[in-house]
């Protein structure tokens, strides 16, 4: 039975040209995290494999930095980066858990972080 929950940074906003850290955390399970995939809609941004390290999709290599931890840093933000991001945790023996983050990239300098929330 899958008992874990994914905690994410929730709905977040950031300034155009700035950077943002996409972060998820898996809790309430003893399952081993083998890999985390980061996706935007149907596009892979990066993979962090516990043993093999990081894969960064070539189309994002100049704007995505691995970490901190299993998270992902998105740099040089544009308004086109607005949208849904997913962290997909591959675990053993539970299987996969998915968390969702919505990022809004703002033209103005007023960009606030939303509250943290959980997805079961």
């Amino acid at each position: 039975m899958m008992t874990g929950t994914i905690e994410t940074t929730g709905n977040i906003s950031a300034e155009k040209g700035g950077s943002i850290i996409l972060q998820c955390h898996l809790s309430s399970t003893t399952a081993q995290v083998t890999q985390v995939n980061w996706e935007q809609q149907d596009q892979l941004l990066a993979i962090c494999n516990a043993d093999l390290g990081w894969h960064i999709s070539p189309s994002f290599k100049d704007r995505v930095a691995p970490g901190p931890g299993l998270g992902l840093t998105l740099q040089s933000l544009t308004v086109n980066d607005t949208g849904e991001y997913f962290c997909i945790y591959h675990t053993y023996p539970d299987g996969t858990y998915t968390g969702r983050i919505f990022l809004e990239v703002l033209e103005s300098s007023v960009a606030e972080h939303g509250a943290r929330f959980q997805i079961p």
Partner: antibody, heavy 119, light 107 residues
Framework: EVQLVQSGAEVKKPGSSVKVSCKAS????????IHWVRQAPGQGLEWIGG????????IYNQIFRGRVTITADKSTSTAYMELSSLRSEDTAVYFC????????????WGQGTTVTVSS | DIQMTQSPSSLSASVGDRVTITCKAS??????VVWYQQKPGKAPKLLIY???YRFTGVPSRFSGSGSGTDFTLTISSLQPEDFATYYC?????????FGGGTKVEIK
Amino acid sequence: EVQLVQSGAEVKKPGSSVKVSCKASGYTFTEHVIHWVRQAPGQGLEWIGGFNPNHDGTIYNQIFRGRVTITADKSTSTAYMELSSLRSEDTAVYFCTRAAKLLFAMDYWGQGTTVTVSS
Amino acid sequence: DIQMTQSPSSLSASVGDRVTITCKASQHVSNAVVWYQQKPGKAPKLLIYSPSYRFTGVPSRFSGSGSGTDFTLTISSLQPEDFATYYCQQHYSTPWTFGGGTKVEIK
């Protein structure tokens, strides 16, 4: 020039073990993951597992059920793949490969080592 | 494990032909797909990754596309040196898995 040079062909008895070596040159050994892939005669490619020399992380294809061990000697930039409890179905060409930096794509390959398992 | 199914398993074509090879994943793999070329008695060579970027030195006649579960390798104008077997591979999740291969033969 990146090169992966593998050890020579082996003939083994069923139940025994084989250890294939792969000497890397032309790049910094600790900066790239080494993978092992095999190909049975006339068949396709099968991923065996990988070794990350940066932090000694090792991952295996569970189809080999603990029969495979991948190690490395960083001082000589050499990776090793040992397969135990050999059976005739393990007869194949074994390739070591290097993964590109920050890419899960195998960009350079060794020449292959033929392992024949026969009684 | 994710299954990668290639089609056709073999094809006959002439120099100058446009050749298309498809690869279908048994589940979503986003764009985590790589293509290799292998000639008899030789090690595979990296052609295309992610899944539309050509590796260093790969001619522009080779192109890749696709996302999700369906992927395509296209050779726009087949050359004599392109007669080989082509494999797709996914790295979306371990174990990494390959397609069964497509052998491109001379007609």
